[in-house]
């Protein structure tokens, strides 16, 4: 027989065996010009030594073949032998350590064969109803196609779809969609009408996400507040990836999740902008408000489940960062400026009560006084920290208000709030006698010994009626009793207690009368 | 060599079915192309259908497009021929054959043949 044409004789090799997991496969006939065909065909296996013959049945029942070598592409003329008007049957054997393997056929008419491409370049996936759907530009001359799909999972092999037949510019395909297992997909085409005509080859890989991306598992810690006011926010552990099929690994356009940090500061109500998104792989500086923290996931789909948690605010105080002035016209404070042009967020509210029922305020960007100080006044009128109660007071700076991640804490403390002079005068108090000589007085905690770091000393005052010559005692802010020696018998006393703080004097207490009496001896 | 064998013939009444099945001895089987003829006696023998090792490719002569219905479980070796709505027409012994070769139409030579089972229709 000669190489050009179909040789109509027994092939040179014994039967085939088509059971073997190895072997041809994806045969594919069609014309590729006005007189001139070609098949192709895969080979699964080992090559070495792999001889592929092209077999074909014709409708007159008599049957030949090409001898194709190692090849696993051939072509013929429509003078081979081989009648290309009628309908013909064509499979591949493969003659390997003495062995044949044996592709499935394909029954077809060769003339009306025409080669169809696979969906080529871009193939848009969105949802629909639950489905996915895929929509591609149809190959250019290749309008009226018949169109299948495959697909699978990580953990389960390749499973057909039929996507119907399709007449248009632009072809599309509804698919299951899994919850949460990505997909791969491919497609291919055949034409449309002309029984038995090859499948095109599969298209490339099309990387589907679930519906639903995986939930977020991650874990947070916080560094402690530096000496800048700020706080790195740090993740302990990663988000776990996702399992992808096969033909997804490596580069899988189509199945990335994204990861988002969203921060909200609770802290500080009155400025302009609350929460802001980052990605999760920059991980910010927090100043040492409080935040919520949420990590959302999302694919091509959307949005996932998210995870949150709260990051607390940190209460480490600084008791003499800021200084409390009270004149006539207002209260003004004072602290230490932390550069030009700066905003501050002032808050405040009261000890002990639910966080959100903080009160701030805002300033307009200032620069450092001469002193390198920053301020902020306001009048008894505005009512601000009006009330004689403790008051947590926390200011924020930033340069850039806007942008919540660059806010940084210059100092939290505690204030008593209204007149703290008087409010914080010492009740109840008393003396008893302690011997000859001495007297014991107690009295009350002042308001201000509620609001840490707020009550500088106690001090007591103590005068003797007959000689007006008077004394005072400083007593430390924990202590609510003090001793007073070197009294004479006989003589009124009167004693009082003041509460001061470190801007201000206290108001005295009501005085109280007393005295040692005389002991007369027997 | 493949060695088929017949069964599942029988006696039933027009418009009644039958499943006939063609069993083969080699695993080989499973590369091979089936079709079953029948044959009446005095007349040649006649194509019925055709099946490709696959299973992708089947052939039916006219005479039974639409009532017959032939496929394949290749890991029993076994190929069946369902036949629906049968007539006294197609009354005669029915012969399963198999070839490396699948045929595209009624046309072709097959290698291997079975012994044949008698199927009776009665009006």
């Known amino acids: 027989c000669r190489t050009s044409e179909c040789c109509f004789q027994d092939p040179p090799y014994p039967d085939a065996d088509s059971g073997s997991a190895s072997g041809p496969r994806d045969l594919r006939c069609y014309r590729i010009s006005s007189d001139r065909y070609e098949c192709s065909w895969q080979y699964e296996g080992p090559t070495a030594g792999v001889s592929h013959f092209l077999r074909c049945c014709l409708s007159s029942g008599r049957c030949c073949y090409f001898a194709a070598g190692s090849a696993t592409r051939l072509q013929f003329s429509d003078q081979a032998g081989v009648s290309v008007l009628y309908t013909v049957t064509l499979w591949v054997e493969s003659w390997a350590r003495n062995q044949t393997e044996k592709s499935p056929e394909v029954t077809l008419q060769l003339y009306n064969s025409v080669k169809y491409e696979p969906p080529l370049g871009d193939i848009k996936v969105s949802k629909l109803a639950g489905q996915l759907r895929m929509e591609w530009e149809t190959p250019d001359n290749q309008v009226g196609a018949e169109v299948q799909f495959r697909h699978r999972t990580p953990s389960s092999p390749w499973k057909l779809g039929d996507c119907g037949p399709q007449d248009d510019d632009t072809e599309s395909c509804l698919c299951p969609l899994e919850m949460n297992v990505a997909q791969e997909f491919q497609l291919r085409r055949r034409q449309l009408g002309s029984q038995g005509s090859s499948w095109s080859k599969w298209s490339s890989p099309v990387c589907v996400p679930p519906e639903n991306p995986p939930q977020p598992q991650v874990r947070f810690s916080v560094e402690q507040l530096g000496q800048d006011g700020r706080r790195r926010l740090t993740l302990k552990e990663q988000p776990t990836q996702l399992e992808l099929p096969e033909g997804c690994q490596g580069l899988a356009p189509g199945t990335e999740v994204t990861y988002r940090l969203q921060l909200h500061m609770l802290s500080c109500p009155c400025k302009a902008k609350a929460t802001r998104t980052l990605h999760l792989g920059k991980m910010p500086y927090l100043s040492g408000a409080a935040y919520n923290v949420a990590v959302i996931s999302s694919n091509q789909f959307g949005p996932g489940l998210n995870q949150t948690w709260h990051i607390p605010a940190d209460t480490h105080t600084e008791p003499v960062a800021l200084n409390i002035s009270v004149g006539t016209n207002g209260t003004t404070m004072y602290w230490p400026a932390r550069a030009q042009s700066m905003t501050y967020c002032i808050e405040w509210q009261p000890v002990g009560q639910d966080g959100g029922l903080a009160t701030c305020s805002l300033t307009a960007p200032q620069d450092p006084d001469p002193a390198g100080m920053a301020t902020y006044s306001w009048s008894r009128e505005s009512g601000a920290m009006g009330q004689e109660k403790c008051y947590y007071i926390t200011i924020f700076a930033s340069a850039h208000p806007e942008k919540l991640t660059l806010w940084s804490t210059v100092l939290s403390t505690y204030h008593f709030g209204g007149n703290a002079s008087a409010a914080g005068t010492p009740h109840h108090v008393s003396v008893k006698n302690h011997s000859l000589d001495s007297v014991s007085v107690d009295w009350a905690p002042s308001l201000l010994s509620t609001c840490p770091g707020v009550l500088k000393e106690y001090v007591v005052r103590c005068r003797d009626e007959d000689s007006k010559q008077v004394s005072e005692h400083p007593v430390q802010p924990t202590e609510t009793q003090v001793t007073l020696s070197g009294l004479r018998a006989g003589v009124a006393y009167t004693v009082q207690v003041r509460a001061d703080t470190a801007w201000l004097r206290g108001v005295w207490s009501q005085p109280q009368r007393f005295s040692i009496e005389v002991q007369v001896s027997d | 060599q493949v060695q088929l064998v017949e069964s599942g013939g029988g006696l039933v009444q027009a418009g009644g079915s039958l499943r006939l099945s063609c069993a083969a001895s080699a695993r080989i089987f499973n590369s091979y192309a089936v079709a079953w003829f029948r044959q009446t006696p005095g007349k040649e023998r006649e194509f019925v259908a055709s099946?490709?090792?696959?299973?992708?490719?089947?052939n039916y002569a006219d005479s039974v497009k639409g009532r017959f219905t032939i496929s394949r479980d290749n890991a029993k070796n076994t190929v069946f021929l369902q036949m629906n709505s049968l007539k006294p027409a197609d009354t005669a012994v029915y012969y399963c054959a198999a070839d490396r070769n699948y045929y595209p139409s009624v046309l072709g030579k097959y290698t291997y043949w079975g012994q044949g089972t008698q199927v009776t229709v009665s009006s």
């Open positions: 099946i490709s090792w696959s299973g992708g490719s089947t």
